[in-house]
């Protein structure tokens, strides 16, 4: 009686169970009553990562530098290439199929959290008493200079984009 289901790592074809090809190999011909399944290794830059009956191996993923990608781990006949972002770039999603440059925080904003390979820069507005006068992906908001500790007085108030300007105390005060 012909089988209706096959064991693990087998597949049903022409009323008989044939062995699947192991990872790293593709199917050349199905088994017969007299012959085993014929498999062939995947070629250079190709892979198959499961027990399979595929007649073509998959091409290794291309880590496109135009999308900010580089090779993190080179593929084998059994595994795909793993891509990651270039330094200074981050993934557009968890799957990391493309990358974009980290955002810079504009003047008046400081870096709350430095970007990683999977998350962008997080900026925050500089609160009163702090400033940032540069566009940067690294710089936090800096505190205004304390004129008093230098025995000076504030001559020009600070903003979220500028530091205070200190000057000498007016010695002519009554």
């Amino acid at each position: 009686e012909p089988p209706t289901a096959c064991r693990e790592k087998q597949y049903l074809i022409n009323s008989q169970c044939c062995s699947l090809c192991q990872p790293g190999q593709k199917l050349v011909s199905d088994c017969t009553e007299f012959t085993e399944t014929e498999c062939l290794p995947c070629g250079e830059s190709e892979f198959l990562d499961t027990w399979n009956r595929e007649t073509h191996c998959h091409q290794h993923k291309y880590c496109d530098p135009n999308l900010g990608l580089r090779v993190q781990q080179k593929g084998t006949s059994e595994t795909d290439t793993i891509c990651t972002c270039e330094e200074g770039w981050h993934c557009t999603s968890e799957a990391c199929e493309s990358c974009v440059l980290h955002r810079s925080c504009s003047p008046g904003f400081g870096v709350k959290q430095i970007a990683t390979g999977v998350s962008d820069t997080i900026c925050e507005p500089c609160p009163v008493g702090f400033f940032s006068n540069v566009s940067s992906a690294f710089e936090k908001c800096h505190p205004w200079t304390s004129c008093e500790t230098k025995d000076l007085v504030v001559q020009q108030a600070g903003t979220n984009k500028t530091d205070v300007v200190c000057g000498p105390q007016d010695r002519l005060r009554a």
């Epitope: 999308l67 999603s93 799957a95």
Partner: antibody
């Protein structure tokens, strides 16, 4: 050869649910995501959503409540389900290789008409 | 919600003309922008990735520029096969994956 191909009904009645299938070959769904994009006749492309190579699904904010995107890596298929279809949903529906990325590989598209 | 505004929506030009199409994002998307060309009855064809990098097999008369919120596609010398509709697409994140409204390039 790397291909993606859409299949499903060409005619859907208003209020019905649309189910479209994207069948891929030449690449693994564990390595690449697949997105769905539609184009109403004579109008612009609209990104509906996609599924990443890690299985994460993403949806356009305006379509989130009506869409489900799922996949079967063994069957090499990605399925789009869109509920409560309306005549304004009449469009050519494309699947393309890639999740949140650019789309270098597109299917030929399938025209879905919503009419009673 | 995030938007991509493409302009003009259509333009008429002659073979040999220099053509410029712009795309403006409602918030910064770094250089996460692509450009496509679409001809009637066909799926779009990828032209530019990363705002300025030519996709494989695309003629060098096409170029892209911009970063942040403002982007441009330029065709330096329009050829007969370039009459088509062009779309920009952002891919900075899942919440900002959107296509522009398209620009139809017609024969003058």
């Amino acid at each position: 050869e790397v291909t993606v191909k859409e299949s499903g009904p060409v005619l859907v009645k208003p209020t019905e649910t649309l189910t479209l299938t994207c069948t891929v070959s030449g690449f693994s769904l564990s390595s690449y995501g697949v997105s769905w994009i539609r184009q109403p006749p004579g109008k612009a492309l609209e990104w509906l959503g996609g599924i990443g190579s890690d299985g994460s699904a993403y949806y356009a904010s305006w379509a989130k409540s009506r869409l489900t995107i799922s996949r079967d890596t063994n069957l090499k298929q990605v399925v789009l389900t869109m509920t409560n279809m309306d005549p304004v949903d009449t469009a050519t529906y494309y699947c393309a290789r890639g999740g949140i990325t650019v789309y270098a590989m597109w299917g030929q598209g399938t025209l879905v008409t919503v009419s009673s | 919600a995030f938007q991509l505004t493409q302009s003009p929506s259509s333009l008429s030009a002659s073979v040999g003309d220099r053509v410029t199409i712009t795309c403006q994002a409602s918030q910064s998307i770094s250089q996460g922008l692509a450009w496509y060309q679409q001809k009637p009855g066909k799926p779009p064809k990828l032209l530019i990735v990363g705002a300025s990098n030519l996709a494989s097999g695309v003629p060098s008369r096409f170029s892209g520029s911009g970063s942040g919120t403002d982007f441009t596609l330029t065709i330096s010398s329009l050829q007969p096969e370039d009459f088509a509709t062009y779309y920009c697409q952002s891919y900075f994140s899942s919440s900002s994956t959107v296509f522009g409204g398209g620009t139809k390039v017609e024969i003058k």
